[in-house]
Every structure is written in C-alpha cells, then in structure tokens.
C-alpha cells in the first residue's frame, strides 16, 4: 500500500512537472478581466497587467483557445483527484501575486473552482484552494 502511494505520488509530481498550466492561468485571468470590463473596472486598480487580453482576446476567441488547451492539460489529472487538486493549487499559487485586491482574488478562486466542471471533469473533493503565497511544502 505504502509503496503504491509513493509511486502514485511520484507519478503526480512528474505529471505536474510535465503539465503546462499556463493556458489555464491565462484563460482565468482573461475571464475575470472580461467580467471586470462588463461590470466596470475599479478606477484605483493599475490599468495594465501582463495578462491583459488583447482586443482579439476580448472577443473571446483567444480565451476559448486557452480554455481548450487548459482542459486538455487538466484532462491528464482526471483519474487522480489529489493530483487534480495539486494542479489547481499550483494555478492559484502562481497567480496569487498578480491578483489585485480581495475581490479579484475571490473572483479568480470562484472561476478556478468551476474550471474542472467547465472542462467536463470531476471537481476534486477535500481540496483546499485557500493558498497563501509562500505555498505548501511539496510532497
């Protein structure tokens, strides 16, 4: 049992290392920025961001392309709930420094939680996305 877990653990680690979660990050950032544009941007937030969508992305085509690539990556974790959770935590961790304010952070988290469902995958159980920058120790 223990041996199998260690092997499973290593498999998850190598899956995470191989995975390109960047399209997921871009898709989510664009999604929350589009929502902000719809509801009116916070006048105090800095206007430019490295993830700020281009006019092409604002029409949604770029974002759906990111979503498709993101779903392909997440699909790799479908049979390992713990690994799926790790992937989502990694996305949250990678973006936590780029999110401006509590509201944007909550919005990002909400979209991130919905991501597996959007991809037609099962959301992981017992998965804590309340990640602080500084992170968790790796397994």
């Amino acid at each position: 049992r223990q041996q199998w877990e260690l092997q499973g653990d290593r498999r998850c680690q190598s899956q995470l290392e191989r995975a390109n979660l960047r399209p997921c990050e871009q898709h989510l950032m664009q999604k929350i920025q589009r929502d902000e544009d719809s509801y009116g941007r916070d006048p105090y937030s800095p206007s430019q961001d490295p993830y700020s969508p281009s006019p092409y992305d604002r029409r949604g085509a770029g974002s759906s392309q990111h979503q498709e690539r993101c779903c392909n990556e997440l699909n790799e974790f479908e049979n390992n709930q713990r690994c799926m959770c790790e992937a989502l935590q990694q996305i949250m961790e990678n973006q936590s420094d780029r999110l401006q304010g509590r509201q944007q952070e909550q919005q990002f988290k909400r979209e991130l939680r919905n991501l597996p469902q959007q991809c037609g995958l099962r959301a992981p159980q017992r998965c804590d996305l309340e990640v602080e920058s500084g992170g968790r120790d790796r397994y």
Epitope: E5, D9, R82, C85, E86, Q89, R113, R122, A123, P124, Q125, R126, C127, D128, L129, E130, R136, D137, R138, Y139
Partner: antibody, heavy 123, light 110 residues
Framework: QKQLVESGGGLDQPAGSLKLSCKDS????????MTWVHQAPGKGLEWIAN????????DYLDSVRGRFTISSDNTQNMVDLEMNSLTAADMAIYFC????????????????WGQGTLVTVSS | QPALTQPSSVSGALGGSVTITCSGT????????VSWYQQLPGSVPKLLMF???KRPSGIPERFSGSKSGTTASLTISGLQPEDEADYYC???????????FGGGTKLTVL
C-alpha cells in the same frame, strides 16, 4: 432537536464481535457523510470510518480495515459499525458523528456528535 | 503516534490569549482543510472551526483559525475559565485515505 444516539456497546471477549448502531432524529442522514470516531480511556480522538450515506464511498482506518464494516440504512436513518476480531486495543468509547463534507472543495468536519457508547474487550 | 502534532498542553492567563498549533505534512494539512474541536472534561467533542477559518453558528468570535503551509493554528482570545478543555485538530490525509486527529492539547486557564 438534532440528535444522534449510539447503541450496541458492551463487554465482549477478545476475538469477539459487536455491532454498534447510530440512529438520528432531527435531520436526514441521507444527505450527509457519517463517521465513527473512538476514544480509548484517557486518550485522544481517533477516526475509525466514513460512509457516504448512499453507501457509494467508505473509508477505514488501516488498523480496522477488514475487521470493521460501516454500513447505512437510509430508510431507518441508521448507520452501523460491525466490529469483528476485537482486541484490547479496540476498547474505547465509540462516537458516531455527522460529517459536513461536501462533494468538492470542502473538508471533513464533525458538526453533530452522539453521546458515545462504551466498548469493553476483556476475557 | 498521531501524524498531526499538537503541544500536549498550553496555558494562558484569564482574559489573555493562547494559540494552539497543529503541524502535519503536504499530504494532510498542506492539501486539505482543517477542523478544530473542544472537548470539556467528561463531555462530547464540539466543533469549533471548520474549513480552516469558518466558525459554526454559536461559536464566539474569540475563537479563530488559520492555516499556513502545513501548520494550522487555533487562537483563543479573552480566555475564560470555561475554556479549560482538550482541543483537537483534524484533517484528511490524501496518502492514507483517512481522517487524522492531532494528539490533543490540554488548555489551562491561570
């Protein structure tokens, strides 16, 4: 009034068997996970087993797997713990608790507890 | 030996505050939500905190929870004599597919 009531505890010999039951009144168990936790005299809490009320998921502590069986009966609002091959290490108060675990992005937490039933193992 | 480590005892002055820590690993606390329980002498455990920081209704605000990395903490401020009890943390362990409880911390109010 939400309440969980355990029964079935008592004295048994080593290698014997007991069946504990937990009945609820005041809420519908079928929407929840249920859990058994035990506490040996003067010791801390130790989780024993979880069951999703439709019976589709069961998890056990390693040291009881194969000896203990958790089951549920939604029509009776009951959760049972069948204990076989009892040893002195199983001697404890057994609590049943409602587990607030949801289907995703939440943790296990035990928000309603029974009063506990004492299991004594002695020859 | 519980896989979640808590101090066996802590004490604090009446009206003061104490923090009880619960440390684990990536496969339990680092990955999953933590809950906290209070067990008064001769009584049934009572849920104090769930999903790291959430208080069930009826639990006073002087109880607060937090989590950083693989350590969770329960802080009790405005200590009262009735807070004297055993406190337990718990979380799921993804390696063991099991819920783990900490060994418990006995709180004494001076």
């Amino acid at each position: 009034q939400k309440q969980l009531v355990e029964s079935g505890g008592g004295l048994d010999q080593p290698a014997g068997s007991l069946k504990l039951s937990c009945k609820d009144s005041g809420f519908t168990l079928s929407t929840f996970y249920m859990t058994w936790v035990h506490q040996a005299p003067g010791k801390g809490l130790e989780w024993i087993a979880n069951i999703k009320q439709d019976g589709s998921e069961k998890d056990y502590l390693d040291s009881v797997r194969g000896r203990f069986t958790i089951s549920s009966d939604n029509t009776q609002n009951m959760v049972d713990l069948e204990m076989n091959s009892l040893t002195a290490a199983d001697m404890a108060i057994y609590f049943c608790a409602r587990n607030g675990l949801q289907d995703s992005y939440s943790g296990d937490f035990f928000d309603h507890w029974g009063q506990g039933t004492l299991v004594t193992v002695s020859s | 030996q519980p896989a979640l480590t808590q101090p066996s005892s802590v004490s604090g002055a009446l009206g003061g505050s104490v923090t009880i820590t619960c440390s684990g690993t990536g496969s339990n606390i680092g990955h999953n939500y933590v809950s906290w329980y209070q067990q008064l002498p001769g009584s049934v455990p009572k849920l104090l905190m769930f999903d790291n920081t959430k208080r069930p209704s009826g639990i006073p605000e002087r109880f607060s929870g937090s989590k950083s990395g693989t350590t969770a903490s329960l802080t009790i401020s405005g200590l009262q004599p009735e807070d004297e009890a055993d406190y337990y943390c718990a979380t799921w362990d993804a390696d063991l597919s099991a819920v783990l409880f900490g060994g418990g911390t006995k709180l004494t109010v001076l």
